[in-house]
Amino acid sequence: EEELQVIQPEKSVSVAAGDSATLNCTVSSLIPVGPIQWFRGAGPGRELIYNLKEGHFPRVTPVSDPTKRNNMDFSIRISNITPADAGTYYCVKFRKGSPDVELKSGAGTELSVRAKPS
């Protein structure tokens, strides 16, 4: 049985302030079951950016329909980017549990924010 992979194809993305940023992430398998979450930064102080399971993330929308049972694309779009959004974003697969257990992280995508053209 092949090991599940979390694929973040872009190492870096550059976006102008005020625009939207698309952060791509796909998984190689839907099993084992468990949620995908997006974080900015790594380690214990990382910031939760998006979690399909629960929570309200008004600036974040999934690129693909996450309610499709065969969905393997967990890319997100973040609107109205500001310099404060700069950082490295990680797509993380969890295995179900109490609590859910981190299984594998993508390599990360560094988001840089350019000044808005005048």
């Epitope: 079951v33 309610t67 049972r69």
Partner: antibody, heavy 118, light 108 residues
Framework: EVQLVESGGGVVQPGGSLRLSCAAS????????MSWVRQAPGKGLEWVAG????????YYPASVKGRFTISRDNSKNTLYLQMNSLRAEDTAVYYC???????????WGQGTLVTVSS | SYELTQPPSVSVSPGQTARITCSGG??????YAWYQQKPGQAPVTLIY???KRPSNIPERFSGSSSGTTVTLTISGVQAEDEADYYC???????????FGGGTKLTVL
């Protein structure tokens, strides 16, 4: 308050057709996957169809595949189940149910009775 | 026939603890839920995602999982808990929603 109200049940002859409706309110219908679950008299629950939030992807068990079609109109907040080539064993109360992020059911309608009899 | 297996009946005295088990699904590809149904009524969701309880459900209802078996525990059973209880699942390997055959809980 989440509300799901089914309609369209009735008596139909074997080989006949029927379309059930489920009117949804109290939540963002277009963001949730939905399903139909039935219960034959004195029997247990049986899932018969599921549909993604956008309506592009549908799912069925072998028992109804090719005879039942689930669809939705997000502009009307309504879920449908088109049932063709009905058989006596399709006699049941049909419930519509809202799906959670991982395709379990959190809210149920009150059900509508379908009787297939000559 | 039902893909998930649960006992047809369980009896318990008021105030005691009732446990209903459900098995048959692969741990790695299944999520489980528990539904309560009283005669002539629609099902009500008691537990989802194996052990999560909706906010409107009393704390005496809890879910747990161990390997391929999940358990619904009702602590301090009350007369109003007499009902049919269904184990339901989502199977990611087949994109289907199997159910157990139901367990009739009798409060003695």
């Amino acid at each position: 308050e989440v509300q799901l109200v089914e309609s369209g049940g009735g008596v139909v002859q074997p080989g006949g057709s029927l379309r059930l409706s489920c009117a949804a309110s109290g939540f963002t219908f277009s963001s949730n996957a939905m399903s139909w679950v039935r219960q034959a008299p004195g029997k247990g629950l049986e899932w018969v169809a599921g549909i993604s939030a956008g309506g592009s992807d549908t799912y069925y068990p072998a028992s109804v595949k090719g005879r039942f079609t689930i669809s939705r109109d997000n502009s009307k907040n309504t879920l449908y189940l088109q049932m063709n080539s009905l058989r006596a064993e399709d006699t049941a109360v049909y419930y519509c149910a809202r799906e959670t992020w991982n395709h379990l059911f959190d809210y149920w309608g009150q059900g509508t009775l379908v009787t297939v009899s000559s | 026939s039902y893909e998930l297996t649960q006992p047809p009946s369980v009896s318990v005295s008021p105030g005691q603890t009732a446990r209903i088990t459900c098995s048959g699904g692969s741990y790695s590809s299944y999520y489980y839920a528990w539904y309560q149904q009283k005669p002539g009524q629609a099902p009500v969701t008691l537990i989802y995602s194996d052990d999560k309880r909706p906010s409107n459900i009393p704390e005496r209802f809890s879910g747990s999982s161990s390997g391929t078996t999940v358990t619904l525990t009702i602590s301090g059973v009350q007369a109003e808990d007499e009902a049919d209880y269904y184990c339901g699942g989502y199977d990611q390997s087949s994109y289907t929603n199997p159910f157990g055959g139901g367990t009739k809980l009798t409060v003695l």
